[in-house]
């Protein structure tokens, strides 16, 4: 880029609704203008969720946003909501990218800038750009959580970010399920995380000019063990046409490994329990939770004999948990009942 | 064997100043967590900070930021708190305590702080 | 930050009595709770950490329950080394915070 070019999204004009999320890398000293929505009802732009005022060195202004001249602090994640309503007209990220200078490629990156450039930055150790959001320091959480450690910063040049677990270079690599280092956010994120996770995670910015670093705790929890927990409301009592297809769905949530049965109540001899007190069944499917779809039953081309109580069994070496939901079928469709009730098949 | 042992407490008068010293043994110094824990007389427990050595990063309890401090000597695997503009309020057996990330796990003697004019 | 209500704040009881200690967080505290004794001229001793996990060393007849914001310490028989001042310690946010003692005397 030429330190005279500016970035710009795209002219002033009606936004599309779908926006994607972008990200932008922009020169220290470099103009930005971006736009979003039509100038007399452009949306408001928010940087970090605090709305930019009109005025300013940042400034957002009838749908624009304005940056006269870009510097590490401004970047960030910013977003356009249309006037009136919270809908994202435009969300993106900016990222500072190398300082617009004139210097050459072999110059060394740290000697002095020219201060007659008016492009030019002059060298900052790290600094932490949003401390508010670091000061939630401990983090104690039940095991299988995701925990995110975030320590924005900014510096010239850009520093560079790495992390330490008690001490100890931390890549992640001796932990299962590994780790996410977004560089970009300044972020390490563990996901699932377990007991042998807890410790002190030292986030360590450093570049030419010098370092910081900031210390997170984490605690985790061990789940105590406990039969399976199915979610409420599922399967879900459903009405069907005959000849329809049908699906019942049971969430299941298992720390030890599960076994997952449905199971069709059926009458024998004209009862429904048995001399034992438990009910008649019939296993339609059975199968372990990594199985694909086994929480699942799909019940095609429905007759007037698939009506009835099914119950999703799901049980684990603590105990077994079970819900049930019932199945009615009705005849096809004719005009009139079509008439009266449009939708043909609904969940309770 | 982890051992914490507190030391420097005593009488001071209000305004004053004072610095207690918690030498420490039986484990590495450097990355644990050391923290201060007070107990006024007839009260219950109040944690005032902790300082990871190794780095020296220090989180203080809100209502003591102004006047206290905590640090570090890695060489001596010593920890400190700094205590000035002492007040009434401030006498209390002081406690030092490796911190295992949410709870304590090993803990000195105490020594006993007495503002009084 | 989080309170911690203790109670009772002290209790006579006879050795071989079942004795329980209560302690409420203002706020949900999942299951960072911690139990610690106090004995004269002694260091304080972690009891129980993470609600009911018993540390290594403590006898079994101490145990700890609850979930959120109401939990309990019980000595099923009380023996005549028992005899001390117990607190709780929540370890899901700074600062941490602790209860006020509760004092188990001799009847």
């Known amino acids: 880029l030429e330190a005279s070019e500016e970035v710009e999204l795209e002219p002033c004009l009606a936004p599309s609704l779908e926006q994607q999320e972008q990200e932008l890398t922009v020169a220290l000293g470099q103009p930005v203008r971006l736009c979003c929505g039509r100038a007399e009802r452009g949306g408001h732009w928010y940087k970090e969720g605090s709305r930019l005022a009109p005025a300013g060195r940042v400034r957002g202004w009838r749908g624009r946003l304005e940056i006269a001249s870009f510097l590490p602090e401004d970047a960030g994640r910013y977003l356009c909501l249309a006037r009136g309503s919270m809908i994202v007209l435009q969300n993106l990220t900016l990222i500072t990218g190398d300082s617009l200078t004139s210097s050459n490629d072999d110059e060394d990156p740290k000697s002095h800038r020219d201060p007659s450039n008016r492009h030019s930055y002059p060298q900052q150790a790290p600094y932490w750009t949003h401390p508010q959001r670091m000061e939630k320091k401990l983090h104690a959480v039940p095991a299988g959580n995701t925990v995110k450690f975030r320590c924005p910063a900014a510096g010239n040049p850009t520093p560079t970010i790495r992390w330490l677990k008690d001490g100890q270079a931390f890549h992640g690599e001796n932990r299962i399920g590994g780790i996410r280092l977004r560089h970009q956010h300044w972020s390490l994120v563990m996901e699932s995380v377990v007991p042998s996770d807890r410790g002190t995670y030292t986030c360590l910015v450093e570049n030419a000019v010098g370092s910081i670093r900031y210390n997170y705790l984490l605690d985790v929890l061990e789940r105590s063990p406990h039969r399976p927990i199915l979610q409420a409301g599922l399967p879900a009592n459903t009405t069907a046409v005959v000849g329809s297809d049908v699906e019942l769905l049971c969430k299941v949530y298992s720390d030890a490994q599960p076994h997952i049965q449905w199971l069709k109540h059926i009458v024998i001899n004209g009862s429904s329990f048995g001399a034992d007190g438990f009910p008649y069944v019939q296993v339609l499917k059975t199968a372990d939770i990594n199985s694909s779809e086994v929480e699942v039953l799909y019940l095609r081309n429905v007759s007037a004999e698939d009506a009835g109580e099914y119950t999703c069994l799901a049980g684990n070496s603590i105990g077994l948990s079970y819900q049930s939901a019932w199945l009615t079928v009705l005849p096809e469709e004719d005009p009139t009942w079509t008439a009266a009730a449009p939708e043909a098949r609904y969940t309770d | 064997e982890v051992q914490l042992v507190e030391s420097g407490g005593g009488l001071v008068q209000p305004g004053g100043s004072l610095r207690l010293s918690c030498a420490a043994s039986g484990y590495t110094f450097t990355n644990h967590w050391m923290n201060w824990v007070r107990q006024a007389p007839g009260k219950g427990l109040e944690w005032v900070g902790m300082?990871?050595?190794?780095?020296?990063?220090?989180t203080l309890e809100q209502k003591f930021k102004d006047r206290f401090t905590i640090s570090a000597d890695t060489s001596k695997n010593t920890a400190y708190l700094q205590m000035n503009s002492l007040r009434a309020e401030d006498t209390a057996v002081y406690y030092c305590?490796?911190?295992?990330?949410?709870?304590?796990?090993?803990w000195g003697q105490g020594t006993l702080v007495t503002v009084s004019s | 930050d989080i309170q911690m209500t203790q109670s009772p704040s002290s209790l006579s009881a006879s050795v071989g009595d079942r004795v329980t200690i209560t302690c409420r967080t203002s706020?949900?505290?999942?299951?960072?709770l911690n139990w610690y004794q106090q004995k004269p001229g002694k260091a304080f001793k972690i009891l129980i950490s993470y609600t009911s996990r018993l540390h290594s060393g403590v006898p079994s007849r101490f145990s700890g329950s609850g979930s959120g914001t109401d939990f309990t310490l019980t000595i099923s028989s009380l023996q005549p080394e028992d005899f001390a001042t117990y607190y709780c310690q929540q370890g899901n946010a700074l600062p941490y915070t602790f209860g006020q003692g509760t004092k188990v005397e001799i009847k």
């Open positions: 305590t490796r911190g295992d990330i949410s709870l304590f796990d090993y």
């Open positions: 300082i990871l050595p190794v780095d020296s990063e220090t």
């Open positions: 706020q949900d505290i999942s299951n960072f």
